[in-house]
């Protein structure tokens, strides 16, 4: 998906209301020092692109973080402002259909949020030239 | 079977109300971002508002009009349209963005 036409404004706004606050709660009881940020994004639609990517797509350590509640709120944004986004069907959806009753959150699935936190951080400062 | 069924759509005059409803089986709705989209004839499908752990999203064009509710003990979300203008006439859907639609609902807002 191609996020260049998004509302990137209120996108953003839907990432300091509600999205980073989920985040943060996620990560509750980790040190903001723990995991060093190895992912970036040079503009907007990039970041978006990579937050698409880790937030949806499986990963060895981290089978999905799409049943998360920071998750859902990302998708139901884009849904909104990004045209064209929600007939895309994202495949790590499927999986939440049947939900495991206790949650297990690894190390891994950690230092992946830690890595959305960076990339949304990113996103809210485009005009900032890339370290 | 796992589907989404909308109902609620019809003919309203401008100015008035409907309320359509998206009755979700084979799932619970609640484990999902869902959404409702609309196309009028000849245009792109758009998001019209959305909704996530009781977190709502509006398209600028009806913000203010239109209510997106889940009643998770229903299976069923719901889109309540205020202040309908002829430009609110398209086939409503209802989703599980993402994964799965309904198969619309018609809404002509017409005098």
């Known amino acids: 998906y191609d996020f260049t036409n998004c509302d990137f404004e209120k996108i953003k706004a839907a990432y300091l209301s509600t999205i980073s606050k989920d985040l943060i709660t996620y990560m509750s009881g980790t040190k903001s020092t723990e995991f060093n940020n190895t992912v970036s994004c040079s503009n907007r639609p990039h970041c978006l692109t990579e937050i698409q990517s880790l937030t949806f797509n499986p990963t060895a350590g981290c089978a999905s973080l799409a049943k998360e509640m920071f998750a859902m709120k990302t998708k139901a944004a884009l849904a909104i402002w990004c045209p064209g986004y929600s007939e895309t069907q994202i495949n790590a959806t499927q999986a939440m259909k049947k939900r495991r009753k206790r949650k297990v959150t690894t190390n891994k699935c950690l230092e992946q949020v830690s890595q959305l936190q960076g990339l949304w951080r990113r996103f809210n400062r485009p005009l900032l030239k890339q370290q | 079977e796992v589907q989404l069924v909308e109902s609620g759509g019809g003919l309203v005059q401008p100015g008035g109300s409907l309320r359509l409803s998206c009755a979700a089986s084979?799932?619970?709705?609640?484990?999902?971002?869902m959404g409702w989209f609309r196309q009028a004839p000849g245009k792109e499908r758009e998001g019209v508002a959305t909704?996530?752990?009781?977190?709502?999203y509006y398209a600028d064009s009806v913000k203010g009009r239109f209510t997106i509710s889940a009643d998770n003990s229903k299976n069923t979300a719901y889109l309540q349209m205020n202040s309908l203008k002829p430009e609110d006439t398209a086939v409503y859907y209802c989703?599980?963005?993402?994964?799965?639609w309904g198969q619309g609902t018609l809404v002509t807002v017409s005098s």
């Open positions: 084979g799932f619970k709705l609640g484990y999902y971002a």
């Open positions: 909704i996530a752990g009781g977190t709502t």
């Open positions: 989703a599980a963005i993402g994964w799965r």
